[in-house]
């Protein structure tokens, strides 16, 4: 599940990883667009093991995965789901 959140919080990510994470380990991916107190786009991966990792938006693997998910979402709904949450 891919989620796009708009929040009024500052940046959430202190450290970012560029290491590939297999889909079967991922619960959901949260995208925090640039703005609202944070000057950069942030991507947070919530894993099935209950841990969370911030992913470098420039990491090749996440860009490739997002492209696959975008293509899939335009042809097959409802997975993945794009959610916009405005507090």
């Amino acid at each position: 599940v891919l989620e796009v959140y708009y929040t009024s919080l500052r940046c959430r990510c202190v450290q970012e990883s560029s290491v590939f994470i297999p889909r079967r380990f991922i619960d959901r991916i949260q995208i925090l667009p640039r703005g609202n107190g944070c000057p950069r786009k942030e991507i947070i991966v919530w894993k099935k093991n209950k841990s969370i990792v911030c992913v470098d938006p420039q990491a090749e693997w996440i860009q490739r995965m997002m492209e696959v998910l975008r293509k899939r979402s335009s042809s097959t709904l409802p997975v993945p789901v794009f959610k916009r949450k405005i507090p």
Epitope: S18, V19, F25, K47
Partner: antibody, heavy 120, light 107 residues
Framework: EVQLVESGGGLVQPGGSLRLSCAAS????????MSWVRQAPGKGLEWVAE????????NYAPSLKDRFTISRDNAKNSLYLQMNSLRAEDTAVYYC?????????????WGQGTTVTVSS | DIQMTQSPSSLSASVGDRVTITCKAS??????VTWFQQKPGKAPKLLIY???YRYTGVPSRFSGSGSGTDFTFTISSLQPEDIATYYC?????????FGGGTKLEIK
């Protein structure tokens, strides 16, 4: 120091069964996905199965899933592979491996293997 | 299943040589590729993960690159202790699959 020690291998007749064990130490076993990988004599590596910490996500090599069952006992820090209806082509060294799903996301620690020989 | 086609199956090189092994996936595996080293009678050892990241303690002469379907493993300057069989593996999706291996020998 992380240690994975396989046991339970041996000589078994075709059609027979065997249960392999993998005892883990030096890691928080209950946190990690685990896999079995095998290697036939003089051949390459073949992934057999994997299991997540809660035992609710299990995947098998399609050709083996009807005969092999992976399981674990977190209280005993142990991983198991139940092998039924064994065939000559199951003869191999069987390795257990930890799958790190925190930072590497790959099989980073391996045991030394246990040998299974299926022969009449 | 995703097939991993590794080449060459064997190669002979001299100490100090640059050695390159390639692996081709039958479909896109993103950067979900590892490289293992296996010496006779021993368990495989993880060298490279996520296509290009060196595992802890692995010498800098070992490197990996690639994404999608084409991957490369390189030893920049071959050492005698590097004599082993090397395997690529995709962990993008299950069933996890390995390449057929490359047996590396010293000339």
């Amino acid at each position: 120091e992380v240690q994975l020690v396989e046991s339970g291998g041996g000589l078994v007749q075709p059609g027979g069964s065997l249960r392999l064990s993998c005892a883990a130490s030096g890691i928080d076993f209950s946190r990690y996905w685990m896999s079995w990988v095998r290697q036939a004599p003089g051949k390459g590596l073949e992934w057999v199965a994997e299991i997540n910490p809660e035992s609710n996500f299990i995947n098998y090599a399609p050709s083996l899933k009807d005969r092999f069952t992976i399981s674990r006992d977190n209280a005993k820090n142990s991983l198991y592979l139940q092998m039924n209806s064994l065939r000559a082509e199951d003869t191999a060294v069987y390795y257990c491996a930890r799958q790190d799903d925190y930072s590497v996301y790959a099989m980073d620690y391996w045991g030394q293997g246990t040998t299974v020989t299926v022969s009449s | 299943d995703i097939q991993m086609t590794q080449s060459p199956s064997s190669l002979s090189a001299s100490v100090g040589d640059r050695v390159t092994i390639t692996c081709k996936a039958s479909q896109d595996v993103n950067t979900g590729v590892t490289w293992f080293q296996q010496k006779p009678g021993k368990a495989p050892k993880l060298l490279i993960y996520s296509a290009s990241y060196r595992y802890t303690g692995v010498p800098s002469r070992f490197s990996g690159s690639g994404s999608g379907t084409d991957f490369t493993f390189t030893i920049s300057s071959l050492q005698p202790e590097d004599i082993a069989t090397y395997y690529c593996q995709q962990y993008y999706s299950t069933p996890l699959t390995f390449g057929g291996g490359t047996k590396l020998e010293i000339k």
